[in-house]
């Protein structure tokens, strides 16, 4: 080993070196939280970049760069260090127009803490392992969601566009002429029935057990879907999103009420099956796999 390499190894294995790097990262994080940093922080920023560069150089000199089994770039944690340094120099010396987007990558410096604190390294390792083990469960989840999304698509396509329409029009107005001119919120409120405080027109349906319109209004299929057009079963992707919402139970009762009002109470069965399978079974299966992965990592 050359004298330079010997020195680099001595520095690398010294506990004070690890302490220095840890303190640098933590101080750097504190500086990053500043709202309006004073001008002198620019010099501090250069100091941090210098320390990170020194750390990487020591590691490269001690272990080698990339040729060989235990070299610098063979350790995934060092990839993070490398990216941090590359972006530090990029944002400083290269004029790349929208630098604010690149500055976002400075936040990666906080992640360096993981590679320095051993306990944290273990937990993150377990997390990565659990993600690997989750692949099968994720495939099953996506498959189940896709199947139910297709069923939802067939059952409820277009249903959430059913609205209660006013039974009085101007002489020259017809349903189609109104459909072609509906744009603003006032237009919608002029022709459709809204419950007090509601941002969407009252939904209705054409089957006997679906929601009926009040006196003076008729059910028609016009305009956009509820919630600014984001709630629907009109395409596979929207249906998939709706099913994901049911699985995660994200304000699912509103989707349930909207769909049942537009399609009919019979379709409650669909929601019962989805909630039992998707929400109770699949979610707990995911949690079980994560728990198992942590258990394995601890052993």
């Amino acid at each position: 080993f050359s004298p330079l390499r010997r020195i680099s190894i001595k520095i690398l294995v010294h506990s004070l070196f690890s302490m220095l790097i840890m303190c640098t990262i933590l101080t750097n994080c504190i500086f990053m939280t500043m709202n309006n940093p004073p001008d002198w922080t620019k010099n501090v920023e250069y100091t941090f970049t210098g320390i990170y560069t020194f750390e990487s150089l020591v590691k490269i000199l001690a272990r080698g760069f990339c040729v060989g089994e235990f070299t610098f770039l063979r350790d995934p944690w060092n990839w993070l260090d490398f990216v941090v340094i590359v972006f530090a120099y990029l944002t400083e010396f290269v004029n790349l127009g929208n630098v604010s987007a690149l500055r976002t990558f400075r936040v990666l410096r906080a992640l360096k803490t993981i590679s320095v604190i051993p306990g944290l390294k273990t937990i993150v390792g377990a997390l990565i392992q659990s993600v690997k083990k989750l692949s099968d469960v994720m495939i099953l989840t996506v498959f189940c969601l896709s199947v139910f999304a297709l069923i939802g698509l067939q059952l409820f396509m277009g249903n959430l566009k059913h609205k209660c329409f006013r039974n009085s029009l101007e002489n020259n107005e017809t349903l189609e002429s109104i459909m072609n001119t509906l744009e603003s919120e006032e237009d919608f409120r002029k022709y459709f029935y809204y419950l007090e405080g509601s941002k969407d027109a009252l939904l209705c349906g054409f089957s006997t057990d679906s929601g009926q319109c009040p006196e003076g209004y008729t059910c028609v299929k016009i305009g956009r879907n509820p919630d600014y057009g984001y709630t629907s079963f009109d395409t596979f992707s929207w249906a998939f999103l709706a099913l994901f919402r049911l699985m995660t139970q994200d304000y699912w009762e509103n989707l349930y009420q909207q769909t049942l009002r537009a399609a009919g109470k019979t379709y409650m069965i669909f929601f019962v099956v989805v909630i039992f399978l998707g929400s109770f079974y699949l979610i707990n299966l995911i949690l079980a796999v994560v728990a198992m992965a942590y258990e394995e990592q601890n052993q």
Epitope: N159, S168, L169, F206, T218
Partner: nanobody, 124 residues
């Protein structure tokens, strides 16, 4: 194919009467906002004659008030236009319009569905 069946047109003398019928007997017709009668006089735009809403309320064009009566028979899914005191200027092609929702078999669709038209000629 969604079709409105119109009937009752023909030749009548001034001052005479005619009763037009518009049947929406096809199972495709689910629910209307209104069903109405429109007419087109050669060289002019199609204009509203009368219409009857789902709830039973009616609209008439100024020229039809007092002379024409629109009514509906929900059991037969038919709308009628009773035309009295007919004048030569009432000569036109009368169209039935179902403005509402139909079932295509795959989905519900709302819009305007026109009949083929029935010719009314008022002349002595």
């Amino acid at each position: 194919e969604v079709q409105l069946v119109e009937s009752g047109g023909g030749v009548v003398q001034p001052g005479g009467s005619l009763r037009l019928s518009c049947a929406t007997t096809s199972r495709a017709f689910i629910r209307d906002v209104f069903t109405g009668w429109y007419r087109r006089v050669p060289g002019k735009e199609r204009e509203l004659v009368a219409r009857i809403y789902n709830g039973g309320n009616t609209n008439y064009a100024d020229f039809a008030k007092g002379r024409f009566t629109i009514s509906r028979d929900n059991a037969k899914k038919t709308v009628y236009l009773q035309m009295n005191s007919l004048r030569p200027e009432d000569t036109a092609l009368y169209y039935c319009l179902f403005s509402g929702t139909i079932n295509t078999g795959r989905e519900y669709r709302s819009g305007d569905y026109w009949g083929q038209g029935t010719l009314v000629t008022v002349s002595s």
